[in-house]
């Protein structure tokens, strides 16, 4: 069971300092941006991180949403990352959800975050290069110290 708490506005970056944004095709991508680029591309660069209480002690449960024309929420259904047109719900009556991730602070690096899927244990949000694009994907952690699954989260409010 997950119960919604508060939300905060955040900019999410990978460890190469590329900014996460949602493109015109609703795809989550990373791109090099100056601070002014980041501001100019808002609200596509501003993510709503909603925190949830969890009936089990598993970590800080969150959803990641973006509000362009409508609110879309990040999902990892079938291990495929996409934004679904939906508001983060007030309650989720299940112990797993495709839209709930556990935000984890890497021990020894308070400012580095990982987002583990509640549906697929051991699978994390990651940045992966595909041709010329840097995509947000769901990835099984396969090597120790994998930088692709680490992010920084900068609160904007």
């Amino acid at each position: 069971y997950f119960g919604k708490l508060e939300s905060k506005l955040s900019v999410i970056r990978n460890l190469n300092d590329q900014v996460l944004f949602i493109d015109q095709g609703n795809r989550p991508l990373f791109e090099d941006m100056t601070d002014s680029d980041c501001r100019d591309n808002a609200p596509r660069t501003i993510f709503i991180i909603s925190m949830y209480k969890d009936s089990q002690p598993r970590g800080m449960a969150v959803t990641i949403s973006v509000k362009c024309e409508k609110i879309s929420t990040l999902s990892c259904e079938n291990k495929i990352i996409s934004f679904k047109e939906m508001n983060p719900p007030d309650n989720i009556k299940d112990t797993k959800s495709d839209i709930i991730f556990f935000q984890r602070s890497v021990p020894g690096h308070d400012n580095k975050m990982q987002f583990e899927s509640s549906s697929y244990e051991g699978y994390f949000l990651a940045c992966e290069k595909e041709r010329d694009l840097f995509k947000l994907i769901l990835k099984k952690e396969d090597e120790l110290g994998d930088r692709s699954i680490m992010f920084t989260v900068q609160n904007e409010d």
Partner: antibody
Framework: EVQLVQSGAEVKKPGSSVKVSCKAS????????ISWVRQAPGQGLEWMGN????????YYAQKFQGRVTITADESTSTAYMELSSLRSEDTAVYYC????????????WGQGTLVTVSS | QSVLTQPPSASGTPGQRVTISCSGS????????VNWYQQLPGTAPKLLIY???HRPSGVPDRFSGSKSGTSASLAISGLQSEDEADYYC???????????FGGGTKLTVL
């Protein structure tokens, strides 16, 4: 780097209560779990329970259920552990520990507070 | 009596490789991650290994963890005198809905 600073040593009578504090400085406090773990002289570690300050959710080990109360004050970044109906077997060093990665991964520990229960 | 079983003591000479075992059951290690802590004499425990085999920054790569079935182990290679300490394994136990520690292993560097 987060630092957890605990209150000083206490000597208590059997049947009384003790309240130990744990103040966090230099990092995020509210969204992570704070656990309390005790260690009797010459013995191993024993988890008592935890709190997620932001949600107020608490989880207690069955052994301590009804006797321990864990609270947190977000405004001062301080967590508290109160243990009641003290007996001599409760003589131990009590540690608070922060869990930022997972509620059960204690990545930062306080210095410990010795509680002695003696008549 | 601890839910997780560790040998009470272990020893080795400088430069040697030492392994400390931690045995549990399907209600804890078999279905959950294992963490390891080092407690130097007179100090608070310190996180050494988390999630079976991950090292926090600052922990030397001489320390490694592994898990197989309902058991886990901590390996220390190139043993040094400063490794003399108590080592504790920890996991989550579903049957007691509680986090559990092993009884601890006192490592002596001869």
């Amino acid at each position: 780097e987060v630092q957890l600073v605990q209150s000083g040593a206490e000597v208590k009578k059997p049947g009384s209560s003790v309240k130990v504090s744990c103040k966090a400085s230099g990092g995020t406090f509210n969204s992570y779990a704070i656990s309390w773990v005790r260690q009797a002289p010459g013995q191993g570690l024993e988890w008592m329970g935890n709190i997620i300050p932001m949600t107020g959710q608490t989880y207690y080990a069955q052994k301590f259920q009804g006797r321990v109360t864990i609270t947190a004050d977000e405004s001062t970044s301080t967590a508290y552990m109160e243990l009641s109906s003290l007996r001599s077997e409760d003589t131990a060093v009590y540690y608070c520990a922060r869990a930022a990665y997972h509620p059960l991964v204690f990545d930062n520990w306080g210095q410990g507070t010795l509680v002695t229960v003696s008549s | 009596q601890s839910v997780l079983t560790q040998p009470p003591s272990a020893s080795g000479t400088p430069g040697q490789r030492v392994t400390i075992s931690c045995s549990g059951s399907s209600s804890n290690i078999g279905n959950h991650y294992v963490n390891w802590y080092q407690q130097l004499p007179g100090t608070a425990p310190k996180l050494l290994i988390y999630r079976n085999n991950h090292r926090p920054s600052g922990v030397p790569d001489r320390f490694s963890g592994s898990k197989s079935g309902t058991s886990a182990s901590l390996a220390i290679s190139g043993l040094q005198s400063e490794d003399e300490a108590d080592y504790y394994c920890q996991s989550w136990d579903y049957s007691g809905f509680s986090t559990v520690f092993g009884g601890g292993t006192k490592l002596t560097v001869l």
